[in-house]
Interface confidence: low
Amino acid sequence: GWVWNQFFVPEEMNTTSHHVGRLRSDLDNGNNSFQYKLLGAGAGSTFIIDERTGDIYAIEKLDREERSLYILRAQVIDITTGRAVEPESEFVIKVSDINDNEPKFLDEPYEAIVPEMSPEGTLVIQVTASDADDPSSGNNARLLYSLLQGQPYFSVEPTTGVIRISSKMDRELQDEYWVIIQAKDMIGQPGALSGTTSVLIKLSDVNDNKPIFKESLYRLTVSESAPTGTSIGTIMAYDNDIGENAEMDYSIEEDDSQTFDIITNHETQEGIVILKKKVNFEHQNHYGIRAKVKNHHVDKQLMKYHTEASTTFIKIQVEDVDEPPLFLLPYYIFEIFEETPQGSFVGVVSATDPDNRKSPIRYSITRSKVFNIDDNGTITTTNSLDREISAWYNLSITATEKYNIEQISSIPVYVQVLNINDHAPEFSQYYESYVCENAGSGQVIQTISAVDRDESIEEHHFYFNLSVEDTNSSSFTIIDNQDNTAVILTNRTGFNLQEEPIFYISILIADNGIPSLTSTNTLTIHVCDCDDSGSTQTCQYQELMLSMGFKTE
């Protein structure tokens, strides 16, 4: 039978040939009568055999990582007979490992993100190296990891390649670190091979910085003419954090006057100081307020970094604006009786300069021929007033600063002209009355009414009477209806057109004013030739014709 031991050949042998071992038949007595042959992949090229002895040689450098074993066939022939001495047999040559491969990090590049200020021991990332050498052959592929760069902030677990934080890091000082990890085989013993990889470790931001004002004092100005809502300036804090951790909210901490507000511009992270109430230079020309700034989002565990909000003091100077005169009242109403003489006192308006310099004021009345105003604001009449022409006057009074004539204010002044009883009542219309020649006594000739141009405080009451002469003539009489009307009645039977065609009756109408006024009003009564029915219609028709120039028969 065949005799051989397990065959091993070390890889990477630099010698031209290397003795692998010997194949032998136990029938071989050493007399060189047997011929050994090698068959199979690698026979003749990688391995040769001494046909006489069966010694096998490797004739080229082997690489276990390329091919770790060769399966060959052996034959032995008796030279003398040409017959096989032993049946052909298969055998194996194993390539034994040497440490000729350094560890390699196959998954690079490595990149990890870890929150800043993470505690010691926080896991960052695991790096893994591979070694092509034989893991079952000694320590050739047993790796140890170590940190070449990254102390004192990082550490690596020697056997697992797990990178952990070993010291607190602040993103605001440095936001990324290149850590260099070395993997050594042979568990780090002499002759070990190594490979390195770089790990980019980025620190993500945590909110470990509170915003701090850039200035401890800001000086701003606001015009006293500024409307509410005006932005009067900006204040700014800085926060070393980034993103939402740097978002901040500004607010008022102290403002006794409650005049200002602060809103946050979330795009620029500035605080905008806003006017909440109008300011008045003459009332208060400077303000001091305190503002504070806080982060918008703060996690509970980071509250220790945000214990006291940063504050700043804001001094606000009010700028004086030359303001127009200010009237004591928004409008004035004065009363004056009609018929008072020219130059009569109506009333006084008063305006002052609200500014500190207190300019004297000049007054004027816009487009009025009836009233005058002096530099003291006293309004007087320039004419006698007649309520029956105008009962109210709407004036526009203008106040102008003497020191700056562009500073003008105007207000309305209403003057009511009060009534005095200066008009007697009179017929409300022109009356033409007619009486038939054959009229009987007590016949109603005309109903009359009166009007009075005066204003009545209560109700007008008119008193109707015939004049003394007419009362005595007794052709007609009057009855006062007590409702501001009266009726004229005949006081006799029969009238004569030829003798007395027209009567002129004087009617006295008195009012109830104090003193009472009386007017004399003439009522014309025409005597008519009437038909039997006593109608004055034809009489009226005749009058109409006569007035038009026609004669009736």
């Epitope: 010691e120 004192p152 607190k168 602040d170 000082l173 701090i212 850039k214 401890s216 940063s310």
Partner: antibody
Framework: QVQLVQSGAEVKKPGASVKVSCKAS????????MSWVRQAPGQGLEWMGI????????TYAQKFQGRVTMTGDTSTSTVYMELSSLRSEDTAVYYC?????????????WGQGTLVTVSS | HSVLTQSPSASGTPGQRVTISCSGS????????VNWYQQLPGTAPKLLIY???QRPSGVPDRFSGSKSGTSASLAISGLQSEDEADYYC???????????FGGGTKLTVLG
């Protein structure tokens, strides 16, 4: 080279206040914290408090709370430390020391020191 | 007493190596950077080591710092007579929200 120049020696009576100044130059004054550290005769170093000159943010040691006030003037790059209600045990050399951009980063430059003597 | 504990004194002969220790707690050394200051007689303190083991430029490499857990140490090798000074450790304390100094160690160079 960074310089921190402190004001001169002071002699004060018990109950009084003292204000020590520290003028900084040759660096960006508003970027770094400034601490005050004192050293009583023959004793060790004692931290009093810290100020960020930009915004005037302060943190004081518990021991000095209520008695110490630290302020900064960005226009003159000067920080001030005022200690009130002085007592004899406040006799010490007072140092200003520049910190980092974080409260917890080391002091790399120190002022020359100001001797404050409290004596009746 | 100080929050950070330092031995009051240390000594060594020229050329020797001496170590000064500083002991604290989780809220200070355990979670923050340790700094060392040297104060020569009659002068202001000077930064010697920062961030546990970093040396400012100008500080000889004879000085080294290290930190482990809640303790830190300053090592001076090749001791020289000009190293005679007070040495202070200092660290930010998260609980106290302030800086704390060790009580200081007086280093004497003998002979």
């Amino acid at each position: 080279q960074v310089q921190l120049v402190q004001s001169g020696a002071e002699v004060k009576k018990p109950g009084a206040s003292v204000k020590v100044s520290c003028k900084a130059s040759r660096y960006t004054f508003t970027s770094y914290y400034m601490s005050w550290v004192r050293q009583a005769p023959g004793q060790g170093l004692e931290w009093m408090g810290i100020i960020h000159p930009s915004g005037g943010d302060t943190t004081y040691a518990q021991k000095f709370q209520g008695r110490v006030t630290m302020t900064g003037d960005t226009s003159t790059s000067t920080v001030y430390m005022e200690l009130s209600s002085l007592r004899s045990e406040d006799t010490a050399v007072y140092y200003c020391a520049r910190g980092g951009i974080k409260l917890w980063l080391h002091f790399d430059y120190w002022g020359q020191g100001t001797l404050v003597t409290v004596s009746s | 007493h100080s929050v950070l504990t330092q031995s009051p004194s240390a000594s060594g002969t020229p050329g020797q190596r001496v170590t000064i220790s500083c002991s604290g707690s989780r809220s200070n050394i355990g979670s923050n950077f340790v700094n060392w200051y040297q104060q020569l007689p009659g002068t202001a303190p000077k930064l010697l080591i920062y961030t546990n083991n970093q040396r400012p430029s100008g500080v000889p490499d004879r000085f080294s710092g290290s930190k482990s857990g809640t303790s830190a140490s300053l090592a001076i090798s090749g001791l020289q007579s000009e190293d005679e000074a007070d040495y202070y450790c200092a660290v930010w304390d998260d609980s106290l929200n302030g800086w704390v100094f060790g009580g200081g160690t007086k280093l004497t160079v003998l002979g």
